[in-house]
Interface confidence: medium
């Protein structure tokens, strides 16, 4: 069958019909519906929402909608024994205690089951000791403290400001530095934009607002008790001592009112430079301990949270493909929230809901996509991407053989300035072409394309007249599909102006103040940015599922491979003497990249010329495109990170949110000058160059003529 036998409408009309059916008013209505009560993973409320979504997706017209459940390790505060932090005097009396909850926003005073701020998976404990301020608790912050300032964090409680890197990396760094507890806080320098009022009068973080979040270092493992395998009814579970990624020291988050009380008394060393100062009226002294009059006072943490194996529920909807039902295009986003989820995740879930409704409308009119589309509402993303990872582990054999693409759909907005896209290079041309066909929602760009406003506001640093597209890192549900399974992936949302707003994320992230009203009053009153994101996400899914030839351009991979090879070579060339001493050469990598470039170019020429009416040849060419991302997977994974298997991209070892290119080589080179055995360290660099060169060459060969 050709794809047009699947439908009585022309392909171009289909896309227009799909996009025209998406309505801002529906997204608004869905967002309201999804945000009236908390939907914390593992709770009855979130199970009920799963069943509601299942029912509505069926009504919208999907072929089947099933719940997929797993029993995974989650973490909750003790309801009768709250978590808090104290300042204690020399007699052990608590002279100051941090708040036990966030003041609820107007209209939500009587809502039950608002989980108080906590760091999910913190162990229990009541450590007490001197405080050390560690800035953002990044790798480089601890280098500054330990190497330059000679400050020892061993046996200390450290206080770190949120921002810049994933909180789990902060905790890992603190553990490695010997700390016995971690306090995380939101500094106004990072979470209070100048000239904007705090919630409920604006979108800034009030002093009592606190960011929740997990502090795991899972490295892609999913459920900590069942790494590599689904947490199903007959699962073998590790003991808690063998669980993957759990922190070993107590951790707790606070707002900036409470942080002020802790930081104002700090003594010891002055901050090393201005980059260690936030916006509170405190000296930002590093410590250790309090100054003069307060030097006998200590900080004490009281953490009583528990880890519990709990049932979670994904919703999986299927729209069967008419021509290639065994090829899957997946649109997935999570449903669970910390509290109301006004932005994270429900601004994304509402968009997915409207995309499903639009596809369902077309299906009811007799249309089907060429390939199967799977829709997913993931659970327990906030607890470590658990729902998506367990489902992918359960279905890995199907996914690695049939997975064409995964499009992520968490928060649709983190600002209202311009589009932000992170994706595989295979999707660059798809994103460019699609955004040229969509209207920009931005003021001052009426009648202009989304591509034009995006390119103006967020230009590529390398290619004139093109928009910036970033690497995929992690911290969201695409991780297992891209980093573990090698399925081409992408994500899109509306973002802030990174040049003028240097705060981290959006100020109310993971706080109780992330409400429907936050979005409706301050971010997107007309829901026009949500609609644009729905068009981008939905349009990508439509094209991926419906185009006769997959809309992947392998030549764009060649371009970035050269860029990444240049970058990693230039990092290595910081050490010219060692490169010479240990005979370190990048020739094999550059040669493989050159071969990839030539073979990709020839493949693209064949792709223009082949007989598209021959279904066998069409399928063969499409399979070469589909399996190209898969070819970058190393079955052995990265050193000490077996579930990060992509050789070109991995989450940074220093910040899970960020992507690193040629991560194996990068990590081998990182801080190599401090390694005790330089011969061994440079041997590992050479091994990683070998792995990368082999993988690029092997991937290139998958694009060669098959015989």
């Amino acid at each position: 069958k050709s794809s047009n036998e699947a439908t009585n409408i022309t392909p171009k009309h289909n896309m227009k019909a799909f996009l025209d059916e998406l309505k801002a008013e529906n997204i608004k209505k869905f967002l309201y519906n999804f945000t009236q009560i908390p939907h914390l993973a593992g709770t009855e409320q979130n199970f009920q929402l799963a069943k509601q979504i299942q029912s509505q997706w069926k009504e919208f017209g999907l072929d089947s909608v099933e719940l997929a459940h797993y029993d995974v390790l989650l973490s909750y505060p003790n309801k009768t024994h709250p978590n808090y932090i104290s300042i204690i005097n020399e007699d052990g009396n608590e002279i100051f205690n941090t708040s036990l909850f966030e003041p609820p926003p107007p209209g939500y005073e009587n809502v039950s089951d608002i989980v108080p701020p906590f760091s999910a998976f913190s162990p229990q404990g009541m450590p007490e000791g001197d405080l050390v301020y560690v800035n953002y608790a990044r790798t480089e912050d601890f280098f500054k403290l330990e190497r330059d300032m000679k400050i020892n964090c061993s046996g200390k409680i450290v206080i770190a400001r949120y921002g810049k890197v994933f909180r789990g990396n902060k905790v890992k760094n603190a553990q490695l530095a010997g700390a016995k507890g971690v306090i995380l806080y939101s500094d106004p320098a990072d979470y209070f934009a100048p000239g904007v009022k705090s919630y409920p009068d604006g979108w800034n973080l009030p002093g009592g607002g606190v960011q929740r979040g997990n502090i795991l270092n899972l490295n892609g493992a999913g459920d900590p008790l069942t790494p590599g395998y689904p947490a199903n009814e007959y699962a073998y579970r590790r003991g808690i001592a063998e669980a993957v990624g759990l922190p070993s020291i107590p951790v707790h988050p606070i707002g900036y009112y409470d942080a002020q009380k802790l930081l104002e008394k700090m003594g010891g060393s002055a901050p090393p430079d201005s980059s260690w100062r936030g916006s509170l009226k405190v000296p930002y002294n590093v410590g250790p301990g309090f100054t003069g009059n307060f030097s006998t006072q200590k900080v004490k943490m009281h953490i009583h949270s528990t880890n519990e194996v709990t049932r979670i529920y994904n919703v999986i909807g299927t729209l069967r493909g008419a021509v290639e039902p065994d090829r899957y295009v997946i649109l997935g986003g999570h449903r669970d929230s910390w509290v109301f989820g006004g932005i994270d995740p429900q601004s994304g879930a509402a968009v997915v809901h409207e995309i499903v409704r639009s596809f369902g409308t077309l299906k009811k009119e007799g249309w089907r996509p060429r390939r199967t589309i799977l829709f997913a509402s993931w659970d327990a993303e906030e607890f470590g991407l658990l729902g998506s990872t367990e489902w992918a582990e359960e279905n890995s054999r199907l996914l690695q053989e049939r997975g064409v693409a995964y499009i992520n759909a968490d928060s649709s907005i983190e600002g209202n300035y311009t589009l932000r896209v992170d994706c595989t290079p295979l999707m660059y041309s798809l994103v460019h072409n699609l955004t040229k066909e969509l209207k920009s929602p931005d003021e001052g760009f009426e009648g202009k394309s989304l591509y034009e406003s995006w390119t103006k506001k967020s230009p590529s640093p390398e290619f004139s007249g093109m928009p910036r597209i970033s690497k995929l890192g992690s911290g969201n549900d695409f991780e297992v599909f891209f980093q573990r399974l090698g399925i081409a992936s992408g994500r899109a949302r509306y973002t802030k102006n990174w040049e003028t707003n240097k705060f981290s994320g959006y100020p109310l992230y993971h706080s109780v103040y992330e409400t429907y009203e936050l979005v409706e009053k301050f971010y997107d009153p007309m829901f026009k940015y949500h609609l644009t994101v729905a068009q981008v996400r939905g349009g990508m899914v439509f094209e991926l599922a419906n185009s006769i030839v997959l809309p992947f351009d392998c030549r764009d991979y060649a371009v970035v491979l050269r860029k990444y090879a240049d970058k990693i070579y230039s990092i290595s060339m910081k050490h010219p003497q060692e490169m010479k001493t240990y005979s370190v050469s990048f020739d094999s990598l550059f040669s493989a990249v050159k071969n990839f470039t030539e073979i990709a170019s020839k493949f693209s020429e064949r792709l223009q010329d082949f007989d598209k009416s021959n279904p066998i040849v069409l399928r063969m060419m499409n399979d070469q495109l589909m399996f190209l991302e898969r070819a970058f997977i190393d079955p052995l994974g990265l050193p000490d990170r077996p579930f990060y298997r992509h050789v070109i991209y991995a989450p940074s070892s220093h910040n899970k949110y960020a992507g690193e290119s040629f991560p194996g080589i990068y990590d081998a080179l990182f801080d190599i000058e401090s390694k005790v055995d330089p011969s061994k360290a440079w041997g590992e660099v050479k091994r990683q160059i070998y792995v990368a060169a082999f993988t690029v060459q092997a991937a290139a060969e998958t694009l060669s003529e098959v015989a």
Partner: nanobody, 119 residues
């Protein structure tokens, strides 16, 4: 916090060479996670990327400007420079230096300096 400041003459005669320097403060130009760019914006137009450099001298240029541009770095002074030869009135623009990386939070740029090409 890292800050970038452009410096150089605001007026250049046609056919001469435009020279600008970017001084980086609050952080080392040797940081391997970043590359250092020159960008320009013609009056009423979008941004045009000129080129970028890694601290050790690995350079990429905009192909349309490659024949006229040299970007260099001086790690000892924490500076990088732009030289553009054979300028014409079409090179009149606000010139920015920028720090970049592969991720969104990496992007910073200076205040910009207006360079007018006129006799």
């Amino acid at each position: 916090q890292v800050q970038l400041q452009e410096s150089g003459p605001g007026l250049v005669k046609p056919s001469q060479t435009l020279s600008l320097t970017c001084t980086v403060s609050g952080g080392s130009i040797s940081n391997s996670g970043y590359y250092w760019s020159w960008i320009r914006q013609h009056p009423g137009k979008g941004l045009e990327w000129i080129g970028f450099i890694y601290y050790n001298g690995s350079i990429h240029y905009n192909p349309s400007l490659k024949s006229r541009v040299i970007i260099s770095v001086d790690t000892s002074k924490n500076q990088f420079s732009l030289k553009m030869s054979s300028v014409t009135a079409a090179d009149t623009a606000v010139y920015y230096c920028a720090r970049d990386g592969d991720d969104y939070g990496d992007y910073l740029r200076g205040q910009g300096t207006l360079v007018t090409v006129s006799s």
